[in-house]
């Protein structure tokens, strides 16, 4: 197991998850850790505890390894980091990778007030309700935006969007969370259509690949609950 020595360390590796950082309960996920060509061992940590290791074969000169989680559950949802060793030195820790399990327990209801088709500039509020009491609700927009909003609430939360712009149009879903990394089933999608303005088009952007499997978000939220602009479709945490 890795020994902490702060004196001499190698650059931190990059960690990411495929196909997504949001994984349906029971499904598999790959966690990739990219270090150096010379790495002799990679170690994966989960919530600060040693989780897995891989020793690349010398014959295969690779600078990354894949850790496979065969069945995602609430017990494997949380924060992952990785390290690598080259010679006698260990790297610094990668940035944290936050894996969320979805598809737990119950399905929330999502609706929009005053209606799903509104005029540019109109005030819109999303409501998410879940019979099972949860601590927090998340509202996510498919594609087109990397913003997640979260609100605390017992069985219902409201998400005021303010006066809407064309950027607000699209398809939304909400989740109830039992903790930050264990979420309910997704709600049925609600598509917000914006009419009026110069480009008079009420069509929401269509994308054949737009589905939960293609969502990627960095789940760090600021105090207001609105996500910082730091999502990548490959969820590569690097900086």
């Amino acid at each position: 197991q890795r020994i902490n020595t702060e004196k001499e360390t190698l650059p931190k590796p990059i960690i990411w998850a495929k196909p997504s950082i949001m994984v349906t309960n029971g499904n598999s996920v790959n966690i990739w850790c990219q270090g150096a060509q010379s790495a002799s061992e990679y170690q994966l940590y989960f919530e600060g505890s040693f989780f897995a290791l891989e020793r690349p074969k010398p014959s295969r000169s690779m600078n990354k390894v894949r850790f496979f989680i065969s069945q995602m559950t609430s017990h494997t949802a949380g924060i992952y980091t990785c390290f690598y060793q080259s010679g006698e030195l260990w790297s610094k820790s990668s940035n944290p990778l936050k894996l969320v399990v979805t598809g737990l327990y119950d399905t929330p209801n999502l609706w929009v007030y005053p209606r799903p088709e509104v005029t540019l500039g109109e005030n819109v509020t999303f409501f998410c309700q879940l019979k099972t009491a949860t601590s927090k609700f998340f509202l996510l927009k498919e594609r087109g935006s990397n913003h997640i909003q979260n609100k605390y609430g017992n069985i219902q939360a409201e998400f005021p969007m303010g006066p809407v712009t064309r950027a607000h149009r699209g398809t939304y879903r909400c989740f109830g969370s039992y903790n930050d990394y264990a979420w309910s089933f997704p709600s049925e999608p609600v598509t917000l259509l914006i009419t009026g303005g110069v480009e008079n088009s009420s069509l929401a952007p269509t994308d054949p690949t737009s589905s939960l499997d293609y969502w990627e978000f960095d789940l760090s939220t600021n105090e207001s609950g609105l996500q910082k602009d730091s999502a990548f479709w490959d969820h590569t945490t690097q900086n």
Epitope: F46, F51, A52
Partner: nanobody, 127 residues
Framework: EVQLVESGGGEVQPGGSLRLSCAAS????????MGWFRQAPGKEREFVAA????????YYADSVKGRFTISRDNAKNTVYLQMSSLRAEDTAVYYC????????????????????WGQGTLVTVKP
Amino acid sequence: EVQLVESGGGEVQPGGSLRLSCAASGRTFASAAMGWFRQAPGKEREFVAAISRSVDDTYYADSVKGRFTISRDNAKNTVYLQMSSLRAEDTAVYYCAAVVPTYGNNIYVHSAAYNYWGQGTLVTVKP
């Protein structure tokens, strides 16, 4: 579906040896990473040893390093734990576990990674 059945437990004197076996049913054994865990009375389950699916990579808890050896026979769908120089503190129920499927040479140390577990076999070390 994978079923794991441990055997080989029993009572042994300090300094003695035992070999535990874990027989796996199903055709997926060759693609499974395997591990041994143990749980002493009143304590949490702890990692003992693990082996990658390709046989040639192993990892041990510091407490058993140099005394225990994990191995596997993919032809027999069996993983083994050879235990020697046994101590009183090795007394526990020993569980075999599998990660099915897996890739590469992943070795899993954390119990949460394992998706199949055996019922356990009791090892008692006493004079």
